[in-house]
Structures are given as structure tokens and as C-alpha cells.
Interface confidence: low
């Protein structure tokens, strides 16, 4: 009887495949007159269409690369695998969908990089004193979680330009604390102090050398520093095969994109590295602060987990920001930073207790839906994250990819990866919109009223000015 | 297409001057229309970046523009035991410009000021200043409402209350129909922000060159606040005027405070005594709600409506990913004394980092359908992020949600095409309002001329065979 395939009035194989994933096309010349060429596959076979003349592509998922998940992160870190499979190929016909799955493991003893980014405005004077021995303490604590730790240090105040900076009397440029009858450092935007190192005592030494500065207004320029610490990977020394923690400590509000106009700065932040040989951020006075969106993009690109370690007075502010910057955690810093050690350890635990998938470069015509199998083999529909994990746990996700219509570009790829991981699954998609019989098309065919059309897939495709089943 | 995207007129300014940062139409007393363009990084007489203002006579083929002459030299004056100083290097003259009647107001929000007395000082800070010019008569005046002679020590003793030293007056500017200059000063009162208002006529009559510190008796300034929601709120980042209380004899002020309440952002509508009539809150932190404000009647009910831009708004896309695209909020003014409620329409940008909503300009009735239309800029949107201006037509329900026209930047990437916009004035005298678009990164301004709308009616005549 009639069905969706036969009632749409299609006149070509391509049109037929686009009606529904259930439709098939018969290109057999011997198909009895009056039998529809576009129909359910079983109906075409009943109508004696030769099986080899039936066009009925089937969507499929093929695994192309599948290294097994690693147990440990120590050893040759470039061989550590936390996501499986690593590459699959999807073939989808119009409006069809296909399922595939991905497994993620939080491997044990994975290398960790911690970069400590500190507000050195005047009110952080006591905090600087508190963290002088943080390096060795951090190493002791983190040794329980990783045998491969590196730590580094950087500092920020704000853009050294009026009105953020004191510019008079002349002495204030060299000593912004001049009118307070005390001494502090000239103001700076961001300076990189210590490249990530496993010599943890170097951290203590460098911190002891630091001194606070002073700026005029309440918000600081920490977002400039976050951006530079994120994108200057060589300068900072972020390793490819390590967890990246960027610890941001402050007791104040922060400047955001478009604030720079108050200093006459309107050039949008370009998200590039501008830390020169002097280890200072060279574009501090020429480029605006980065936006939350740009920071999110760069943190995600570089697989960096941002930790806002902030004092009680601004914790709500940074909590709100963290909801707009996925993968960010917030901890309450004591007024003198004395609890920062526990804060980092807790934040790292929080980061490792969660796996959340993110998708990059998803073609517009594709939509994905997720089902998560987290703990106890329980399937949770619509979820693409798992919480409450212990290091070493493995979770899996079932993903359905559905295509809308028939995209113009026939091949595309996208990536699925856990937030903060370097490992990912690359999905190569082929959109199967064409029929194999099109390759045997016969232009100017005698079958089409002596050359008035192309004979293709068992029917005539008429040239300009000609109509009819034989272009008559 | 109402705005001709092909036959453009271009005006260019000096390289690196940021010509096009601000702009306005200027009608002189003889009805001639020109374009005033701000170029805040123009080099001054001593090769310092003082900024500058250019007056571009309308000419279909465009070209160069003569600059308006202002005193760009630093000034010093001794008054009793005090020394008053102005500093005009990097003052940003032309960061905002506005024209009213035959007067041009051009502001330098980063003009610095200091007062020295023995070993003490007020501190060298960006109080900001606005220069006024009547090009035909050659008259000049200056208005700097945040200059004062209080020394730093006094501010410390008073816990920095009423501290106008970082005002940046003229960061935004507008003139009411009655000729009152209203300046936004987002750094006023220690970065809360303030508004200053004074009649243009009184600014001219009270001005004496070289005095440096004088009083405009009819001026009024908004008030300081101890409410933490206002701290670092940059109240005055943008400003507009309109009619929002039903009394046609008064004008209300619309003020953008994009970092109000810990960067949530807000826009407030005030009466001329700075009493708040309405407050509209931002929707998303750090979206910069209030970066731009515009007032026009879009739905043809005779009441002014309000548009607010939040160029850093992030939209939740597929996979719950946030994409920074920018958003414009339309608030229709209801009948009677009711508060402006929820936005009637949200226009959301489509391009990542395009900053849709950076500037909004009323266009007048572009398509002659009885409803006023608007233009919205996305200075980093469009192909290759070169910038884009989108036209939205008015209708009885408010605005149409799809643009009627999209103007892609004729300039290269990084030009910030659309950073400044002005419309609703007929520059070429064809009876249709035109649009001027600044692209400070290219140091250029483009003029888009509106063309007559062709209304086609089709009649089908069927003849008996």
C-alpha cells in the first residue's frame, strides 16, 4: 500500500533517499511499469527489482583507532590513554541517526602542573607572607596524588595606566605608595616569575623575592594575567601530558572586557601571547581585558582548569563568573591566604571527581544526544557528565548523532573530549546523500528521446526545455 | 534595500588617529549638513596624541575633512597659593561628539587636571573636559564640571566621598532639545559614575579662556552613593535623553551603568533632578548591559521606547555551550505611569565575538511605513570579523526580529566598522534619512544614503480569448 516513500512524488534516486531513512530506490530498467521506483526495500523486492539494482545505503559507525585505556599516568606520559576509542567514522544518510560510545578513565598518578597566579596589589601584603613556604607544602600534599608535580608562579596588579595607576607626583610612578609614607613596587600588569618546575624550593625562593604594588581602583587586572598564563604555554611551561591547574588568588573584584575604555583602551583582546623576554605582559596598556567568552575558549583549548581562590567578600562574584566559564572551580581563600594549600588540594580533588564531555566543531546539520553510564552501571539519559568519581574510575557515554537533511559538504569532522583532558575522540562524518547508480549515468542517452536527457538510475533526467518520462 | 550599499561616500582621517571613534550630523544655521567626526588619537601641535575633531562637509564623493580648531596646549594658572594645571596629551579629544543647533560639542574624557599647593597636590587625574564650538562664528568654550581645587589629603580625610577626580566627563554626551548638555562621567565619585548637566548657552556665556576653574551657575551634577551596588558601576558609560514620564515639558535622562552590581549591568531612567524613575537590570554578568542606549518610538504609539545593548552577552547554544555574540534589548514604554517591564524583544547576534549591540542608532522612518527603524552594530561581526551593521524595521508590535538589511564592512578586518553610528538625518536632501558609520580602526567614516522605497502593486488583466 501507499507509504511515505511512494506518496512524495519523487523523480530521482537522490530525492528518494532524502524522503526517509526507510526509503529505497530501484534503478532496474526492467521494473514493471506503474511500480514506484521509490519505496520500502521489501516492496521493491516484491516488485521484482533486482537486488543489485536497489539503492539503500545504511548508516554505520566504524571504529578507526582504539588504543586501550591506561591504568596509570606515570611512565611514558605520551602513551597514556584516557579516552577510547580515539577515532571513529560515521556514515549517515539524510535525516538518519547512528549510535556510538566513548569511554573515559581518570587514570591514577597523572602528572600535574600548578601555576600560582597571585594578585600583588597592596591589600595582598599579608598573603604574600603566608605563601612563602607554599611550594614545599604543596609538594608534600600533592605527592599523595601524583609522583610528577611541577609548580610555577606569576603575579598581577592592573594595567599601568591612568586612572588605574597613580601618575603624580613623579615619585609615585616608581613608588605608588609614596603618599602613604611607605615603599612598594612600581605598578605592573602581569609578570611571569617562575616557569613550571619540579624544584619546589625554587617556588619558595621566588615568592620571598616578591613585593606588593598599589593601584587606585578596586577591581584588578587579573583577567589579563589569566589569559596570558593560559596562552603563553611555552613561557609558563605547560606540559602536553599533564593536568593543568591555574590557581588565581585575589581579594578584589576584577576588570572585565570593555572596562579598558576608561583608560582609553579599546582594542579587543586578541587572545595571543604577549609576554616578552622581560617576562612582562607587553600589551597591558594597549589591549583591553579579555571577555569571559574568550577566556573560556582559550582555557578549553589549552585544557587548563582554572581555580578561583578568592576571599569571602568576592566569592559570590567569582562563583557567578565560574558558571559562565565551564570547568572552573571556586574556593574561599582566607584573608591571609593561609588556607590556600588545602584549597588547591580540594579543588584538584573536585576536578578529578568529575568527567564532563565537551564537543568542538560540531557541524550545524548534526545534533547529538548523550546517555551517561557513571557508577553502578546505571544509565542516565540526557547527561554528558559524571560526578563523584574516584581516581581510576571508568565511565562511558552512549551518543546518538542525527543529521538534518543533506549537508552540502559531504565530509566533516568534529571532536568530543572531556573538559580539561588532552585526550579526545575524533568523529569523521560522511553524509551519504548520493546513489551509487549516479556514477553510471549516461548523458544524451538514446533512451531519453534520442539524447534529450541523461539516463540515470533507471530514469531520464531531462535537459533544458524537455519534459516527460522519456523527455519526449 | 533602503540604504544603498554600493554608492557609498567615504571620509578619511589621519592614519592612527582613530577617526570615526565618534560622529554626528551637524546642521549649521544655514541648513547645510556636515558630519562631525571624533578622532581621539590625532596628533596635536607638539606631536602628542591630543585627539581632534573634524568637520566633513557633505559631498557625494567624500574625501578629506578640515579639522576644528581648539586650544590643545597644556595650561597653567596661579591662583593665590595654588597652581592649576591642565594636561592634554592623550586626552582623547573626540572620544564623544554631539551637535546641537549650530554648536558642536567635542569631549576629551581623559584630559588630566592637577592642583599644586606647596608640597601637596590634588593628584593628576582624568577629570575630562568638553570643548564647544560654533564653527560659523568662531566662538569657543570649554566645560569641565569635575575640576576642583581640593587637595588629596582632604579626600582621604573624607573617605573619598564626592571625589570627582577621575570623572572622565564627556565619556558619553548628549544635548537635550532645550539645549542642555548632558555628560556621562563613568569614573565620577571614585568610579561610581556621575552625570553633569548645563545649558549650552550658559557654558558659552560663563566661559573665559585661561581661567581654568570657573562656575557654571546653572549646572547640576548627580549625587554620590554609599550603596555597594553602584561601586565601580561606571554609571554614565552611555547616555541618552527621551520622554518617559508623560510630561512633555521635561526631559528624562537614560544612563547606562554596564558594571553596576558586580558587573550585572543596569540602565536607569532619571528625571532632570536625577531622581530614578526606572531601573532595568542586566541579564548576565559581564555582558556589559548598558554599553549602548538609544531612545526612539519604534511602535508608532507616540511614546519613546528604549533600546539597550549588551555586546558581550553569551548565548547558550547546542550542547549548552556559551557563545559570546551580544544582545540588544527593546523595552516598549507602556501607557500611563507604569514601569518599563520585561523587554518586549531580544535581538541576539549570530557571530562569535561580533559584539552585536556595541552601538545602536535610531534611523527615523527609513522605509516610509510610519514606524521608526534602528541600526545595530556588530563591529567585529560579519565576514572575517570585519564588522557589520544591521537594520531592524519598526512595526506596531515593536521591532521586526529579523534584519531588513545587513551592511557588511567595506573596510578590512580590525576596522571596528560600526563602533559609532548615527542616523535619522537626511544628508543628501532626497527626503530620506541617512546613516553614518564610523570605523575607527580604518580611520574612516562611511555614509549610507537611503533611497526612495519602491512600492509595487501588480494588476492582472485577463482578456477574453
Amino acid at each position: 500500500g501507499p507509504n511515505i516513500c511512494t506518496t512524495r512524488g519523487v523523480s530521482s534516486c537522490q530525492q528518494c533517499l532524502a524522503v526517509s531513512p526507510m526509503c529505497a530506490w530501484c534503478s532496474d530498467e526492467a521494473l514493471p511499469l506503474g511500480s514506484p521506483r521509490c519505496d520500502l526495500k521489501e516492496n521493491l523486492l516484491k516488485d521484482n527489482c533486482a537486488p543489485e539494482s536497489i539503492e539503500f545505503p545504511v548508516s554505520e559507525a566504524r571504529v578507526l583507532e582504539d588504543r586501550p585505556l591506561s591504568d596509570k599516568g606515570s611512565g611514558d606520559s605520551s602513551q597514556v590513554t584516557q579516552v577510547s576509542p580515539q577515532r571513529i567514522a560515521l556514515r549517515l544518510r539524510p535525516d538518519d541517526s547512528k549510535n556510538f560510545s566513548i569511554q573515559v578513565r581518570q587514570v591514577e598518578d597523572y602528572p600535574v602542573d600548578i601555576y600560582y597566579l597571585m594578585d600583588l596589589s597592596y591589600s595582598m601584603k599579608d598573603d604574600l607572607w603566608s605563601i612563602q613556604n607554599l611550594g614545599t607544602k604543596l609538594a608534600t600534599q600533592m605527592r599523595k596524588l601524583t609522583s610528577n608535580l611541577r609548580i610555577g608562579f606569576g603575579a598581577f596588579v592592573d594595567k599601568p595606566v591612568s586612572p588605574y595607576m597613580y601618575i603624580s607626583p613623579p615619585e609615585a610612578l616608581e613608588n605608588p605608595c609614596y603618599d602613604m609614607k611607605t615603599t612598594c613596587l612600581p605598578m605592573f600588569g602581569y609578570k611571569h616569575v617562575l616557569t613550571l618546575t619540579d624544584q619546589v624550593t625554587r617556588f619558595n625562593e621566588e615568592v620571598k623575592k616578591q613585593s606588593v604594588s598599589r593601584n587606585r581602583d578596586a577591581p584588578e587586572g587579573g583577567f589579563d594575567a589569566i589569559m596570558q598564563a593560559t596562552v603563553c604555554d611555552e613561557k609558563i611551561g605547560w606540559r602536553n601530558d599533564a593536568s593543568h591547574l591555574l590557581v588565581f588568588t585575589t581579594d578584589a573584584k576584577t576588570h572585565i572586557a570593555l572596562d579598558g575604555r576608561l583608560a582609553g583602551i579599546v582594542q579587543p583582546n586578541d587572545g595571543q601571547c604577549h609576554v616578552g623576554s622581560d617576562n612582562h605582559y607587553s600589551a597591558s596598556t594597549t589591549m583591553d581585558y579579555p571577555s569571559l567568552g574568550l577566556m573560556t575558549e582559550k582555557l578549553s583549548q589549552k585544557n587548563i582548569n582554572l581555580i578561583f581562590a578568592v576571599t569571602e567578600n568576592v566569592v559570590n562574584l567569582y562563583q557567578n563568573y565560574s558558571e559562565l566559564i565551564p570547568g572552573t572551580t571556586v574556593g574561599v581563600l582566607s584573608m591571609d591566604s593561609s588556607n590556600v594549600l588545602q584549597l588547591i588540594v580540594d579543588a584538584y580533588g573536585k576536578i578529578r571527581s568529575k568527567v564532563e564531555l565537551e564537543v568542538r566543531d560540531l557541524p550545524e546539520e548534526l545534533s547529538l544526544s548523550f546517555n551517561a553510564t557513571c557508577l553502578n552501571n546505571e544509565v542516565i539519559p540526557g547527561l554528558k557528565s559524571c560526578m563523584g568519581l574516584k581516581i581510576g574510575d571508568t565511565v562511558s557515554f552512549s551518543i546518538e548523532a542525527k543529521v538534518r537533511g543533506c549537508p552540502q559538504e559531504k565530509e566533516k569532522s568534529f571532536t568530543i573530549k572531556p573538559v580539561g583532558f588532552k585526550d579526545s575522540l575524533i568523529v569523521q562524518v560522511t553524509f551519504d546523500c548520493d546513489c551509487a547508480c549516479q556514477a553510471q549515468a549516461e548523458p544524451n542517452s538514446h533512451r531519453c528521446n534520442n539524447g534529450n536527457g541523461t539516463f540515470e538510475c533507471g530514469v531520464c533526467r531531462c535537459g533544458p526545455g524537455w519534459l516527460g518520462s522519456q523527455c519526449e | 534595500l533602503n540604504l544603498d550599499p554600493v554608492q557609498l561616500t567615504f571620509y578619511a582621517g589621519p592614519n592612527g588617529s582613530q577617526f570615526g571613534f565618534s560622529l554626528d550630523f551637524h546642521k549649521d544655521s544655514h541648513g547645510r549638513v556636515a558630519i562631525v567626526v571624533g578622532a581621539p588619537r590625532t596628533l596635536g601641535p607638539s606631536q602628542e596624541e591630543t585627539g581632534g575633531v573634524f568637520l566633513c562637509p557633505w559631498r557625494a564623493e567624500g574625501g578629506q575633512c578640515p579639522s576644528l580648531l581648539f586650544d590643545l596646549r597644556d595650561e597653567t594658572r596661579n591662583v593665590g597659593s595654588q597652581t592649576l594645571q591642565t594636561f592634554k596629551a592623550r586626552q582623547g579629544l573626540g572620544a564623544s561628539v554631539v551637535s546641537w543647533s549650530d554648536v558642536i560639542v567635542a569631549c576629551a574624557p581623559w584630559q588630566h587636571w592637577n592642583v599644586l599647593e606647596k608640597t601637596e597636590e590634588a593628584e593628576k587625574t582624568p577629570v575630562g573636559s568638553c570643548f564647544l564650538a560654533q564653527p560659523e562664528s568662531g566662538r569657543r568654550a570649554e566645560y569641565s564640571p569635575c575640576r576642583g581645587n581640593t587637595l588629596s589629603r582632604i579626600y582621604v580625610e573624607n573617605d573619598f566621598s564626592w571625589d570627582k577626580r577621575y570623572c572622565e566627563a564627556g565619556f558619553s554626551s548628549v544635548v537635550t532639545q532645550a539645549g542642555e548638555l548632558v555628560l556621562g562621567a563613568p569614573g565620577g565619585y571614585y568610579f561610581l559614575g556621575l552625570l553633569a548637566q548645563a545649558p549650552v548657552a550658559d557654558i558659552f556665556s560663563s566661559y573665559r579662556p585661561g581661567i581654568l576653574l570657573w562656575h557654571v551657575s546653572s549646572q547640576s551634577l548627580s549625587f554620590d552613593s554609599s550603596n555597594p551596588e553602584y561601586f565601580d558601576g561606571y554609571w554614565g558609560y552611555s547616555v541618552a535623553v527621551g520622554e518617559f514620564d508623560g510630561d512633555l515639558n521635561t526631559t528624562e535622562y537614560v544612563v547606562g551603568a554596564p558594571t553596576w552590581s558586580w558587573t550585572l549591568g543596569a540602565v536607569e531612567i532619571l528625571d532632570s533632578y536625577y531622581q530614578r524613575l526606572h531601573r532595568l537590570r542586566g541579564e548576565q554578568m559581564a555582558s556589559y548591559f548598558g554599553h549602548s542606549v538609544a531612545v526612539t518610538d519604534v511602535n508608532g504609539d507616540g511614546r519613546h521606547d528604549l533600546l539597550v545593548g549588551a555586546p558581550l552577552y553569551m548565548e547558550s547554544r547546542a550542547d549548552r555551550k556559551l557563545a559570546e555574540v551580544g544582545r540588544v534589548y527593546l523595552f516598549l514604554q507602556p501607557r500611563g505611569p507604569h514601569a518599563l517591564g520585561a523587554p518586549s524583544l531580544l535581538l541576539t547576534g549570530t557571530q562569535l565575538y561580533g559584539r552585536f549591540g556595541s552601538a545602536i542608532a535610531p534611523l527615523g522612518d527609513l522605509d516610509r511605513d510610519g514606524y521608526n527603524d534602528i541600526a545595530v552594530a556588530a563591529p567585529y561581526g560579519g565576514p572575517s570579523g570585519r564588522g557589520q551593521v544591521l537594520v531592524f524595521l519598526g512595526q506596531s508590535e515593536g521591532l521586526r526580529s529579523r534584519p531588513s538589511q545587513v551592511l557588511d564592512s567595506p573596510f578590512p578586518t580590525g576596522s571596528a566598522f560600526g563602533f559609532s553610528l548615527r542616523g535619522a538625518v537626511d544628508i543628501d536632501d532626497n527626503g530620506y534619512p541617512d546613516l553614518i558609520v564610523g570605523a575607527y580602526g580604518a580611520n574612516q567614516v562611511a555614509v549610507y544614503r537611503a533611497q526612495p522605497v519602491v512600492k509595487a502593486s501588480v494588476q492582472l488583466l485577463v482578456q477574453d480569448s
Epitope: - | 544655514h30 541648513g31 562637509p57 580648531l69
Partner: antibody, heavy 118, light 107 residues
Framework: QVQLVQSGAEVKKPGASVKVSCKAS????????MHWVRQAPGQGLEWIGA????????SYIQKFKGRVTMTRDTSTSTVYMELSSLRSEDTAVYYC???????????WGQGTLVTVSS | EIVLTQSPDFQSVTPKEKVTITCRAS??????LHWFQQKPDQSPKLLIK???QSMSGVPSRFSGSGSGTDFTLTINSLEAEDAATYYC?????????FGQGTKLEIK
């Protein structure tokens, strides 16, 4: 291209009036100011005033106020300058000049010699 | 009103020589100054607008400079056809005024 064609030479007695015409072509007549400048024999150029044909707005310098009248006829794209109560020192060549879109006197008429003599 | 003072009033020069005519304004006029050439029994002709912008069709030997109150018209390598009177004019503010003129004679 832009052309400004002035009326012919005139000889007038003191106290009389003279009306000089300037016919414009090659541009939109109503969009640009037309100025008048005079030059006494062997002397420099002296600006008299201007008219905006779009709305008949005029502007004269103090010296000529009350004696000079500028008018326009848009149907013929012609501007007129009438000077009354003529004196011998008004003997001069009178030029019309177009104040173009760049605010400069780029186009000039050929000049009209007005001689005031008893 | 703004007074423009030209110097010299008269100059007699041999061909191929470089000529400099100056124009001083009684107050600052930015770059709103223009130079005209007038030959006997002819209308004035605009040479330079806004202090330094040459009009199209004007020989490249003519150039202008200056800003504020002091302006210069320079003719490099004078030619016989350059014999004329040269006027400066300001359009900074009404009334628009001209300099008294500089007459250039070819020896």
C-alpha cells in the same frame, strides 16, 4: 562640469542701484552656497556675502549690510546680487564664486565690471 | 575679523628660481587656509586648499604648508606662466577674508 556665467558690464551713476546675475549649471543648484567677492581696480579681493539657494538664507558682511541684497531664482538656477546707493568706490569687478562641498571657492564666474561714475 | 597679512607685496623673480610667499593670520586658523592665483583680466583660480592640499590640474611645482597662524606657498622652479598675483584666504570663521595679495613679476 560646473559653470558660472555672469551678466555683462554695467555703468551706473552715484546713488543708483545695480543688479548683477550669475547663472549656474553642472551641479545641484540648491545644495551649495554662492558667494560674492569684489575687486576694485588694482586692488585685492574683498568678500561681500553669500546666499544659500536651498532656502534663500543670506549672510552679508557688516560693511555691506543695508545696501546689498542677494536673491535667487531656482527655476533658472540664477543668483542675483543687487547693490544700492552706489558710490564711486563701488567701482569694481564683481565675482560670484561657488562654495563647494569642501568649503572652498573652487569655481568662479568670469566677473562683471560695474563702473560708478557721474 | 581675522586679518591675513601676506609678504612680500611684490616680488620680481627670474625663471627656474624658487619662490616663497608667506601668509600670517591674526589668530590661529588651524589648516583652514587656501591659496589663489589671479592673472590680469582673469578670475582667481584655486591652487591649494586647506594649507597643503593641491587641487587637481595644478602643476606639481606649487605646494603649500603651515598650520595655526603661519602659512607658506612655495613655487619650485618658477615658469614664465606663473606671473600673477597670489592671494591667501581663510575660511575658519566668518567673515571670510583674503590677504592683500603678492604680485609676482618675471624678470
Amino acid at each position: 562640469q560646473v559653470q558660472l556665467v555672469q551678466s555683462g558690464a554695467e555703468v551706473k551713476k552715484p546713488g543708483a542701484s545695480v543688479k548683477v546675475s550669475c547663472k549656474a549649471s553642472g551641479y545641484t543648484f540648491t545644495n551649495y552656497w554662492m558667494h560674492w567677492v569684489r575687486q576694485a581696480p588694482g586692488q585685492g579681493l574683498e568678500w561681500i556675502g553669500a546666499i544659500y539657494p536651498g532656502n534663500s538664507d543670506t549672510s552679508y558682511i557688516q560693511k555691506f549690510k543695508g545696501r546689498v541684497t542677494m536673491t535667487r531664482d531656482t527655476s533658472t538656477s540664477t543668483v542675483y546680487m543687487e547693490l544700492s546707493s552706489l558710490r564711486s568706490e563701488d567701482t569694481a569687478v564683481y565675482y560670484c564664486t561657488l562654495y563647494d562641498g569642501y568649503y572652498v571657492f573652487a569655481y568662479w564666474g568670469q566677473g562683471t565690471l560695474v563702473t560708478v561714475s557721474s | 575679523e581675522i586679518v591675513l597679512t601676506q609678504s612680500p607685496d611684490f616680488q620680481s623673480v627670474t625663471p627656474k628660481e624658487k619662490v616663497t610667499i608667506t601668509c600670517r593670520a591674526s589668530r590661529d586658523i588651524s589648516n583652514n587656509l587656501h591659496w589663489f592665483q589671479q592673472k590680469p583680466d582673469q578670475s582667481p583660480k584655486l591652487l591649494i586648499k586647506y594649507a597643503s592640499q593641491s587641487m587637481s590640474g595644478v602643476p606639481s611645482r606649487f605646494s603649500g604648508s603651515g598650520s595655526g597662524t603661519d602659512f607658506t606657498l612655495t613655487i619650485n622652479s618658477l615658469e614664465a606662466e606663473d606671473a600673477a598675483t597670489y592671494y591667501c584666504q581663510q575660511t575658519n570663521s566668518w567673515p571670510y577674508t583674503f590677504g592683500q595679495g603678492t604680485k609676482l613679476e618675471i624678470k
